[in-house]
């Protein structure tokens, strides 16, 4: 498995790598081969990073910072290659990288540019306050500062209030939107520019159902084909709002290919989920049962939520029984 | 090609200071760490101190550690030696001399042809 | 400190002939030896790195030997331009430390 890091080529011995937080990068360097290889990387032209002479580290006078993060890659050495390996960056460690190599031939710098990217999966949250319903797209830890975008029925919006709080290291962002009476579909699109990463939660409501009490109800819940991968690992959770929250029914792991069902009436069609279709069926309505459904298809790459009203209404053995 | 001239050697009393200098030309002189290695007369040769190429690192031979400052201006090509406290035994011809690469090697590929210091009374 | 001897600390022989200087380390130094040639007069010249390894320009004749605490410089056929003093240098570790020198004298 290669560290997520991608190399950016510009000119003047000077590369870019772009990494993400908390993982492993490559900062690259090469060199003719030679006899007498020394190699010292630097940080910002001060900070010792990592050295190496007379055929092993040299590690008395590294930053503390580096303290069992970085390794080269010893074998290849002898054949021009002075990358380091970095281990677990964070975004303090952005900056210029100086790997200096000298041999019995000559001597090179290369320079190394890291830029640290973050992008916690981001989620799509339907809330309910009061009367008012509520989408909110949001990102715990991103950075640097994303791009959020919204459509309604595949039209952008203007209109984006962002919630932005700071930390050290990254921003936490959540992009509200009142969708109240709306019976429109809602796309968020969540873009890191660095990490050339894009996140999409898409929010459709489905015409409301009326049934009656003791009869059974199905909720379709197809992912859209132009976000779902079926090679990728998702999960599907259907859940009923009530009195403002969600209790959730049953959950779909595809890593897994478990299946949790929390409500005995719930049932899921195997057959339809090994075809993408997670659509349920809840047996044995009760008016208890009015309300909302949820189904939330999720992945690193989208959130697919569908929203289904359910009206269950007294059969009329119950009402002549009243 | 490869020169180092030593300079500012000369007699001077015990418990007095000198300034020697060494300047470079004919390669990068702020690629290489530099060295001060001295010779007394009719004697064999001492390791004095080591400057690395980017100055972060500066070592220093026990019989001159704390006495002696070694330094370097990478702008200008030189280096110096700083030597406070002058004993009799500094008496020698002082070579400034070039590392393979950074300093961190540590024997000496190329010599100036070396500056004498007496300290006498 | 690490303690350098060199031997025999002055040698005589005739051009031609194949000389050896030994060096001993008075601890282990792997190969992180040099040797270095003086002329009456003149800075030292750098011979041999790495115990063995021959620097650009040097003549042929001189090869290096050795590695721990034995060390040796062979000269193959010793020529006039030879004379002079060999040291050897440890650079295994701080504070580098040079043998006393070995004389070499034509005969």
């Known amino acids: 498995i290669f560290p997520l890091a991608f190399f950016i080529y510009v000119p003047m011995n000077e590369q870019i790598v772009i990494g993400r937080l908390d993982e492993d990068i490559i900062l690259p360097s090469s060199f003719e081969r030679g006899s007498e290889v020394v190699i010292h990387w630097k940080y910002q032209d001060s900070y010792k990073v990592h050295s190496y002479y007379k055929g092993s580290d040299h590690l008395e006078s590294q930053d503390p910072r580096y303290a069992n993060r970085t390794s080269l890659f010893y074998n290849e050495i002898q054949n021009g290659n002075a990358s380091l390996f970095f281990r677990r960056v964070s975004l303090l460690d952005e900056g210029i990288y100086t790997c200096y190599v000298g041999t019995a031939i000559q001597v090179i710098t290369n320079k190394v540019v890291l830029k640290v990217g973050v992008f916690l999966t981001p989620v799509m949250k339907y809330e309910k306050r009061n009367t008012n319903s509520f989408l909110i797209c949001s990102v715990l830890s991103v950075y640097p500062r994303p791009i959020i975008t919204w459509k309604m029925d595949n039209t952008p919006i203007s209109e984006n209030n962002m919630e932005e709080t700071g930390s050290l290291d990254s921003f936490s962002i959540n992009s509200p939107l009142n969708i109240t009476g709306s019976n429109s579909s809602y796309e968020c699109t969540i873009e890191n520019s660095l990490l050339k990463q894009t996140w999409t939660g898409r929010w459709t409501m489905k015409d409301g159902l009326h049934k009656m009490q003791s009869e059974h109800v199905s909720l379709s819940c197809q992912p859209v084909n132009d976000y779902f991968s079926p090679n990728q690992d998702f999960k599907v959770t259907w859940s009923r709002m009530k009195s403002g929250t969600f209790s959730v029914l049953a959950y779909y792991l595809s890593s897994s290919q478990n299946t949790i069902i929390n409500e005995s009436r719930f049932s899921w069609n195997k057959e339809l989920i090994n075809q993408s279709d997670f659509s349920m069926n809840l047996m044995d309505l009760n008016l208890s049962d009015s309300g909302e459904y949820l189904c939330n298809i999720s992945s690193d790459e989208y959130t697919l939520l569908t929203i289904h009203t359910v009206h269950v209404e007294p059969s009329q053995e119950t009402a002549s029984h009243n | 090609q490869v020169q180092l001239v030593e300079s500012g050697g000369g007699v001077v009393q015990p418990g007095r200071s000198l300034r020697l200098s060494c300047a470079a030309s004919g390669f990068t002189f702020s690629d290489y760490g530099i060295h001060w290695v001295r010779q007394a007369p009719g004697k064999g040769l001492e390791w004095v101190a080591v400057?690395?190429?980017?100055?972060?690192?500066?070592y220093y031979a026990d019989s001159v550690r704390g006495r002696f400052t070694i330094s370097r201006d990478n702008s200008k090509n030189t280096l110096s030696l700083q030597m406070n406290s002058l004993r009799v035994e500094d008496t020698a011809v002082y070579y400034c001399?070039?590392?393979?690469?950074?300093?961190?090697?540590?024997?000496?590929?190329?010599w100036g042809q070396g500056t004498l210091v007496t300290v006498s009374s | 400190d690490i303690q350098m001897t060199q031997s025999p600390s002055t040698l005589s022989a005739s051009v031609g002939d194949r000389v050896t200087i030994t060096c001993r380390a008075s601890q282990s130094i792997s190969s992180w030896l040099a040797w270095y040639q003086q002329k009456p007069g003149k800075a030292p010249k750098l011979l041999i790195y790495k115990a063995s390894s021959l620097e650009s320009g040097v003549p042929s004749r001189f090869s290096g030997s050795g590695s721990g605490t034995e060390f040796t410089l062979t000269i193959s056929s010793l020529q006039p331009d030879d004379l002079a003093t060999y040291y050897c240098?440890?650079?295994?570790?701080?504070?580098?430390?040079f043998g006393q020198g070995t004389k070499l004298e034509i005969k």
């Open positions: 240098q440890q650079y295994n570790a701080y504070s580098y430390t």
């Open positions: 400057i690395w190429y980017d100055a972060s690192d500066k």
């Open positions: 001399a070039r590392d393979r690469s950074s300093g961190a090697m540590g024997y000496f590929v190329y």
